[in-house]
């Protein structure tokens, strides 16, 4: 796991930004772009 302050703070943001290109579980990513966190 990642325990740095950045990973703790932006865990959800990172998950959202990486969600494009693969549909996981029951949710759907659209408008795939590339964001850096």
């Amino acid at each position: 796991g990642c325990n740095t302050a950045t990973c703790v703070t932006h865990r959800l943001a990172g998950l959202l930004s990486r969600s494009g290109g693969m549909v996981k579980s029951n949710f759907v990513p659209t408008n795939v772009g590339s964001e850096a966190f």
Epitope: V8, T9, A13, L15, S17, F27, P29, N31, G33, E35
Partner: antibody, heavy 119, light 107 residues
Framework: QVQLVQSGAEVKKPGSSVKVSCKAS?????NYWMQWVRYAPGQGLEW???????????VYIQKFADRVTITADKSTSTAYMELSSLRSEDTAVYYC????????????WGRGTTVTVSS | DIQMTQSPSSLSASVGDRVTITCRAS??????LNWYQRKPGDAPKLLIY???GYHSGVPSRFSGSGSGTDFTLTISSLQPEDFATYYC?????????FGGGTKVEIK
Amino acid sequence: QVQLVQSGAEVKKPGSSVKVSCKASGYTFGNYWMQWVRYAPGQGLEWMGAIYEGTGKTVYIQKFADRVTITADKSTSTAYMELSSLRSEDTAVYYCARLSDYVSGFGYWGRGTTVTVSS
Amino acid sequence: DIQMTQSPSSLSASVGDRVTITCRASKDISKYLNWYQRKPGDAPKLLIYYTSGYHSGVPSRFSGSGSGTDFTLTISSLQPEDFATYYCQQGDALPPTFGGGTKVEIK
């Protein structure tokens, strides 16, 4: 300070659509993921989806994917959530929320927009 | 999805009481657990982030603990303004999911 100001309460007929707005101020709009969460009595808090303000990339949960559209207008620092094909179960308070800067979690919330679906 | 189960769903307590609310995740979420307070007509307020971190302005009578699947929110001495509904939320996996809430009422 960060503020999220939402549009007013709506009463809608089943089958119609509603569009809720969330005007952001106090930060650089475009650098964050804006989330949409709803609260319905008996169902609690439910995350619906999110938009990256800068690019318009959206992520929705399957439950709402065919009925929800989340958009953002950088020129007015406003995010929108449109829900179509409304049914009585969509009666809820709809919130926009933003991640905190330095801590995990939704640190900033709008006051909520009550949407009542009734014939 | 990760299911979040809170208990109890409601409790009655008096001012000055120590109150404990538990939250259980259906899978290991490390420490990615946040707690919110919601009052009728108000927006939810972030209290505790990453299991035990205090959000700005949150009184020290609130505290959080746990890791993995089991988490606790404790109010050491309940104050009149603390009567509200409390929700846990996991931020380890998408979609973010919330517990069903614990309503803290006046005894």
